[in-house]
């Protein structure tokens, strides 16, 4: 169109949020859709000075048909005001983000409360129990059962007698890993189960019970305790 | 009989470069993970750094951040510091420690044993 | 960073009296899992940091029963109900919850 337009913001709801703060190593993305006849042109501003891809190691990337400014794994250098300054012939607009770099502290694995959570089902149906772990750090995951041994739940060192049941291995991704399922539960099923997750900093877990009925109808079943031990 | 063993220690100019070794014993070391903390003469400890079981992770203190690094060898099963850009600061007695280990944990998950500690010091 | 601080500097005991340190952090210690990440240590002359308490409450092995730790969330204390001379050292809590790990600058116990 022959309609010459000063630039203009199109999307400023995009815009509102002004103070970034994001964990080192992450990703900044900062937006500043606009319109103008001619269409405008975009460049930004550190702390207001010309921002230069040498100004940052690994530089930046500015995708000018997503008016946007993109820097990748963040460090607490890049901390300060970033101001876009988009412009034709007919004007000139800006908008400044302030971003701040926070270095969090690396924490013991954090497990969401309530999870896992107690279940009970009859002999024969089956049963899962979910485990949510938050970590900085990679963590590891296991699910354990707590089991008997020679009607002992303990052993001559006081300690008590587990089996691993899951664990994250080379082919197993944490979602996979996250979820205990039993399947045509047994009577032996029952018991105590813990999901524990480790990372570098320490270890945090959480139990659940495992509870079974009888099948309705059906005499309850006598069973051994295992005699096993993995 | 757990044990840890530090060496390595030993006078450097400052701006010079020392690598602590912590050699393991009686655990399986690949399952810990494990620390380095440090006590200057006739103060308190300070924590150094961590590193996990599988050396993917590691953690330092700010006040030796991009200057020590801190690694590990499972096939020896021995634990590393190497130590650049020292500073007179820097003087102290450096500890190896057991950290974190890879499986449940019926007692303390870490800082139970704890190596007889070497002394470094920076002085020109 | 996570900043523990202990009290008293210095403490001087009578043989069989008891003895009582404080430490306390800038937040809170207790974590998703129900623990307090407290530990206390004593450092005997020309050795390593020895492993006390855990967890905040827990004895580690071999440790005799006179000592114990109590406390929660912030502030946490080391008591020993008989000191014997064998108790002479440095004693320091330690927070294990998250990186950089802290230390409390300590508190010597000497014999009276």
């Known amino acids: 169109s022959n309609n010459k337009r000063a630039p203009y913001w199109t999307n400023t709801e995009k815009m509102e949020k002004r103070l970034h703060a994001v964990p080192a190593a992450n990703t900044v993305k900062f937006r500043c859709p606009a319109g103008g006849n001619p269409m405008p042109t975009m460049r930004w501003l550190k702390n207001g000075k010309e921002f230069k891809q040498e100004h940052r190691i690994g530089g930046y990337k500015v995708r000018n048909q997503h008016w946007s400014l993109i820097m990748e794994s963040v460090v607490p250098s890049d901390k300060g005001n970033y101001t876009c300054v988009v412009e034709n012939e007919y004007g000139s607009i800006n908008h400044t983000y302030h971003l701040d770099v926070v270095e969090r502290s690396p924490h013991r694995p954090i497990l969401q409360a309530g999870l896992p959570a107690n279940a009970s089902t009859v002999v024969g149906g089956d049963v899962e129990f979910v485990c949510k772990v938050y970590s900085d750090a990679q963590p590891h995951i296991q699910w354990i059962k707590h089991v008997e041994k020679n009607g002992s739940k303990y052993g001559p060192d006081g300690l008590p007698y587990l089996k691993v049941l899951k664990a994250a291995g080379v082919n197993t991704t944490d979602k996979e890993i996250e979820v205990l399922y039993i399947r045509n539960v047994t009577f032996e099923d029952a018991g105590e189960y813990t999901c524990l997750a480790g990372n570098s900093i320490g270890i945090s877990f959480h139990s659940a019970w495992l509870t079974v009925l009888p099948a309705p109808g059906r005499e309850k079943e006598i069973t051994a305790s295992p005699d096993y031990l993995e | 009989e757990v044990q840890l063993v530090e060496s390595g220690g030993g006078v450097v100019q400052p701006g010079r470069s020392l690598r602590l070794s912590c050699a393991a014993s009686?655990?399986?070391?690949?399952?810990?993970?494990m620390h380095w903390v440090r006590q200057a003469p006739g103060k308190g400890l300070e924590w150094v750094a961590v590193?996990?079981?599988?050396?993917?992770?590691?953690y330092y203190a700010d006040s030796v951040k991009g200057r020590f690094t801190i690694s590990r060898d499972n096939s020896k099963n021995t634990l590393y510091l190497q130590m650049n850009s020292l500073r007179a600061e820097d003087t102290a007695v450096y500890y190896c420690?057991?950290?974190?280990?890879?499986?449940?944990?019926?007692?303390?998950?870490?800082?139970?044993?704890w190596g007889q500690g070497t002394m470094v010091t920076v002085s020109s | 960073d996570i900043v523990m601080t202990q009290t008293p500097l210095s403490l001087s005991v009578t043989p069989g009296q008891p003895a009582s340190i404080s430490c306390t952090s800038s937040r809170s210690l207790l974590h998703s899992d129900g623990k307090t990440y407290v530990y206390w240590y004593v450092q005997k002359s020309g050795q390593p940091p020895q492993l006390l308490i855990y967890e905040l409450s827990n004895r580690f092995s071999g440790v005799p029963d006179r000592f114990s730790g109590s406390g929660s969330r912030t502030d946490f204390t080391l008591k020993i109900s008989r000191v014997e001379a064998e108790d002479v050292g440095v004693y320091y809590c330690?927070?294990?919850?998250?990186?950089?790990?802290?230390f409390g600058g300590g508190t010597k116990v000497e014999i009276k």
């Open positions: 590193i996990s079981y599988d050396g993917s992770n590691k």
């Open positions: 009686g655990f399986t070391f690949s399952s810990y993970a």
């Open positions: 330690m927070q294990y919850i998250e990186a950089p790990l802290t």
């Open positions: 420690a057991r950290g974190a280990g890879r499986g449940y944990t019926y007692g303390p998950d870490g800082f139970d044993i």
